[in-house]
């Protein structure tokens, strides 16, 4: 759990973070696990500790091993372990599996490849990107911040992508490379921040006391199969099941897929025998997926019995 695998290439910079959650104000001590010898904090050393980070500038094959970090807060000491392996540089172009970071998938609509671990380093744009050891050239490839964007992705774009950047430490530059596989998904699906079609934000729904009322929460989440998407109702910020009012229940509506391919979900809130106190509640339609959560709030108001006359024209 609190042990993390890290790897790098000899003569490149490697920075490892202690796998314990902590605050910047916490003291972190680093040790060689085998010898219990403390790792220095002076930056003149090739291997030194800097708070949550352990820096190898540059790394050597002999640095491989397990390192212990102890995060000291005012209330606790927490221990973590960094399992570091430094490999010799390959003479050929092939990147072995043990040097690969997690595979990412892309599609025509979404083709970002993030450079792994880059957030730990002090680097400046632009990144250099390579595919199967060839430098990427052409207008289809755009290095943007810490990721590569590929326009009009095709199945031939699948392969191993390497990012290369320079880490700067006190005026000295060190090279870093990281490689991950990119696969291309066939389906043309995509996922968006949820869009709530109904109800409108801050909608006032008219209801009659003693009658039943239905509220529909309807939202769309993108195109094609969605990995995670949900719509639900909350009462005063509380889940319906936890609110404990048996008159008020939610029921899953249709899983819709419109002609334009949009994947949408409905959740119907059924209020039986509307009571006066129901008018005081805040009804929230929530739509959430991996992009985030959107909320539309509805209030109930009493339907005026003479409302059905209000659309008639009055003659003077």
């Amino acid at each position: 759990k609190f042990s993390k695998q890290s790897w790098g290439l000899e003569n490149e910079a490697l920075i490892v973070r202690c796998p314990r959650q902590g605050k910047p104000s916490y003291t972190v001590d680093w040790y060689y696990s085998q010898t219990n010898k403390s790792i220095p904090t002076q930056e003149r050393n090739r291997v030194f500790a800097s708070g949550q980070l352990l820096k190898f500038l540059p790394a050597a094959v002999a640095d491989s091993g397990i390192y212990t970090c102890i995060v000291r807060s005012p209330t606790f000491n927490r221990t973590g372990y960094a399992n570091v392996t430094i490999y010799k540089k390959q003479s050929d172009c092939n990147v072995p599996d043990y040097l690969m970071y997690s595979t990412v998938s892309g599609s025509e609509k979404n083709s970002k490849i993030y450079c792994p671990t880059i957030d730990l380093y002090n680097w400046t744009a632009p990144l250099e990107w390579f595919k199967n050891c060839q430098a990427l050239q052409g207008s289809r490839y755009r290095a943007h911040k810490s990721f590569l964007v590929i326009d009009n992705v095709m199945t031939e774009d699948a392969g191993d992508y390497t990012c290369k950047f320079i880490h700067n430490e006190n005026g000295a530059n060190y090279s870093v490379t990281a490689t991950r596989s990119f696969t291309v998904k066939d389906e043309q699906g995509f996922s968006l921040f949820p869009v709530i079609g109904a109800p409108a934000q801050n909608e006032i729904k008219e209801v009659e006391i003693g009658k039943n009322a239905n509220l529909t929460c309807s939202a769309c989440f993108g195109k094609g199969t969605q990995f995670l998407a949900a719509v639900l109702w909350q009462l005063n910020g509380t889940k319906i099941t936890d609110f404990g009012e048996p008159r008020i229940q939610q029921e899953e509506g249709q899983n819709q897929s419109f002609s334009n391919g949009l994947a949408c979900l409905d959740m119907v809130l059924r209020i039986a025998d509307v009571k006066e106190e129901d008018l005081l509640l805040q009804y929230d339609c929530l739509a959430l997926n991996l992009h985030g959560l959107r909320r539309h709030t509805v209030r109930l108001s009493r339907k005026n019995p003479i409302d059905h006359h209000s659309h008639h024209h009055h003659h003077h």
Epitope: K23, P74, T75, R78
Partner: antibody
């Protein structure tokens, strides 16, 4: 010795909001996390949420999401927990506790909140 | 969500007894389990954190063990002041307390 002193007991009507304070002494509130825990009469402990007072980051348990707000005033080393839309089942003792991200080490004496019409 | 099942809910024992309280999770959480003791009308007190680390000032008759999904708190020889309610707490994902174990004098 670290001490956490909470505000006094409260009686509230359903639908109202309660705000409890927790003053920390012999300890800089910015240096750790502040947690809040609910305990209904005769029941177990329920974690409500935590704040990193140094930057104001909060995380809340799903059960209390949307109704609870945890804040901290680093100038007075005081944390606050506000619970809104009170219902009778919110009648409980509320504890503040300081600790790191993972657990609580020092606790306040507790504040009894009674929700009754 | 991580579910915690603490057992037993009630436990009757005598001074000098060895008692064990168990906390089982529905998913592997390694050693992010902590144990608290609470006496009536008092705030909880941390006994053991991270599975087996005794908090300073806590008597050595208290010990914690286990990893993965099953954790235990053991009191090797019960003392009169140990009769209280004990809670486990997981902090692998947010924080969740077990339901509690009330330890009573037989």
């Amino acid at each position: 010795e670290v001490q956490l002193v909470q505000s006094g007991a409260e009686v509230k009507k359903p639908g109202a909001t309660v705000k409890i304070s927790c003053k920390v002494s012999a300890f800089n509130i910015k240096d750790d996390y502040m947690h809040w825990v609910q305990q209904a009469p005769g029941k177990g402990l329920e974690w409500m949420g935590r704040i990193d007072p140094a930057i104001g980051n909060t995380e809340y348990a799903e059960k209390f999401q949307g109704r609870v707000t945890i804040t901290a005033d680093t100038s007075t080393d005081t944390a606050y927990m506000e619970l809104s839309s009170l219902r009778s089942e919110d009648t409980a003792v509320y504890y503040c506790a300081t600790g790191d991200f993972y657990a609580m080490a020092y606790w306040g004496q507790g504040t009894l909140v009674t929700v009754s019409s | 969500d991580i579910q915690l099942t603490q057992s037993p809910s009630f436990l009757s024992a005598s001074v000098g007894d060895r008692v064990t309280i168990t906390c089982i999770t529905n998913t592997d959480i390694d050693d992010v389990i902590h144990w608290y003791q609470q006496k009536p009308g008092k705030a909880p007190k941390l006994l053991i954190y991270e599975g087996n680390t005794l908090r300073p000032g806590v008597p050595s008759r208290f010990s914690g063990s286990g990893s993965g999904t099953e954790f235990t708190l053991t009191i090797s020889s019960l003392q009169p002041e140990d009769f209280a309610t004990y809670y486990c707490l997981q902090s692998d994902n947010m924080l969740t307390f077990g339901q509690g174990t009330k330890l009573e004098i037989k």
